[in-house]
């Protein structure tokens, strides 16, 4: 029961996390730009991985895509790649984990196969979460190091005026969504890996006991009957002697000990 719950919870947490990663990747508010001394009018800029938007005090909003690849910083391209890889891995992980869920029966799929699939999806979720966290962190670092407080001196032609303007870049909502979503996906992946351990079949030694009624006429029987645990077949044909109980040693059984929980 605990294994099923851990697996199910891991799946749900990862699902929420991957939905968050997709949302963060599509969001426009990765960074915002404010002018300290805006000399013209109230205009608010914010940027995402794919386009830049402007919102005016009147409520008018307009977005423009980055139609050039060459003019974009390599860091931005790297962030895009990390987020896409995270989404792809997460989506594949979700697909695999659906079939791995213990509560879903698909044909005669054994627990060992489900355990392997659970582990695979768990690892995929972990990598997906790490990709998202890395992508968001790289972007945040890019803002802090390159753009955070850029004081620009503008020269316009020969003898033109010089105006110093401070542009403040702040973290947008998408960064926080990405960090949380990446963390959730990571946690979900860890939970799946933990659930995998519970699903994996363990080699357990069962001591099966055969009982025989004592009697004066009981003779030695070469290759007497086999004791069985009901879990598996006895591979060793043991000789059973008269005079009471004898143990069947090392009968191997492969199903999970949680099968009947």
């Amino acid at each position: 029961m605990a294994v099923t719950a851990c697996q199910g919870l891991g799946f749900v947490v990862s699902l929420i996390g991957i939905a968050g990663i997709i949302a963060a990747t599509c969001m426009d508010q990765w960074s915002t730009q404010d002018l300290y001394n805006n000399p013209v009018t109230a205009v608010f800029n914010y940027q995402g991985l794919w386009r830049s938007c402007v919102r005016e005090s009147s409520g008018f909003t307009e977005c423009r895509g980055y139609f050039t690849l060459l003019g974009l910083p390599a860091m931005l391209q790297a962030v895009r790649a990390l987020m896409i890889v995270g989404i792809v891995l997460g989506a594949i992980g979700l697909l695999v984990s659906i079939f791995a869920l213990k509560c879903i029966r698909i044909g005669s799929m054994e627990d060992s196969a489900k355990a392997n699939m659970t582990l695979t999806s768990g690892i995929m979720f972990i990598v997906s979460g790490l990709c998202a966290i890395a992508g968001v962190s790289v972007f945040a670092n890019m803002l802090v190091t390159n753009f955070w407080m850029s004081t620009a001196n503008m020269y316009t032609g020969m003898g033109g005026m010089v105006q110093t303007v401070q542009t403040r870049y702040t973290f947008g909502a998408a960064l926080f969504v990405g960090w949380v979503a990446g963390g959730l996906t990571l946690i979900g992946g860890v939970m799946m890996c933990i659930a995998c351990r519970g699903l994996a079949p363990e080699e357990t030694n069962y001591k099966a006991v055969s009982y025989h009624a004592s009697g004066h006429s009981v003779a030695y029987k070469p290759g007497g009957f086999k004791a069985s645990t009901g879990f598996g077949s006895n591979t060793k044909n043991k000789k059973i002697y008269d005079g009471g109980a004898r143990t069947e040693d090392e009968v191997q059984s492969y199903p999970s000990k949680h099968d009947y929980v």
Epitope: P39, V40, T41, V54, E56, S58, E62, L70, Q163
Partner: nanobody, 122 residues
Framework: QVQLVESGGGLVQPGGSLRLSCAAS????????MGWYRQAPGKQRELVAA????????NYADSVKGRFTISRDNAKNTVYLQMNSLKPEDTAVYYC???????????????WGQGTQVTVSS
């Protein structure tokens, strides 16, 4: 590099009209807003009029309301200031101002033109 090219200044009689224009060129991603400031000798620079390029919201100084009209041409990245009923106190150097997003992954900067002289005198 971004350039702002102003034109249309000159000498005009009181009550007359002038039309200033300012064209922005260079590696412009988009224009947030453009406007006009003026600086009379011995005085501080003041806002005359400004316009946002997306929604076209305008902002005027009280002293020019009803006389001056600001407009923009998005396709040409140009802003115009139509000045009517000019007064001697409108005499100043008029500077174009542009709040722009520049570059592939755009950075927001404010640029100023070199200024154009407007003289209102009889």
């Amino acid at each position: 590099q971004v350039q702002l090219v102003e034109s249309g200044g000159g000498l005009v009689q009181p009550g007359g009209s002038l039309r200033l224009s300012c064209a922005a060129s260079g590696s412009i991603f988009s224009i947030n807003a453009m406007g006009w400031y003026r600086q009379a000798p011995g005085k501080q620079r003041e806002l005359v009029a400004a316009i946002t390029f997306g929604g076209g919201s305008t902002n005027y100084a009280d002293s020019v309301k009803g006389r001056f009209t600001i407009s923009r041409d998005n396709a040409k990245n140009t802003v115009y200031l139509q000045m009517n009923s000019l007064k001697p106190e409108d005499t100043a150097v008029y500077y174009c101002n542009a709040d722009l997003l520049v570059g592939g992954f755009p950075r927001r900067n404010v640029y100023w033109g070199q200024g154009t002289q407007v003289t209102v005198s009889s």
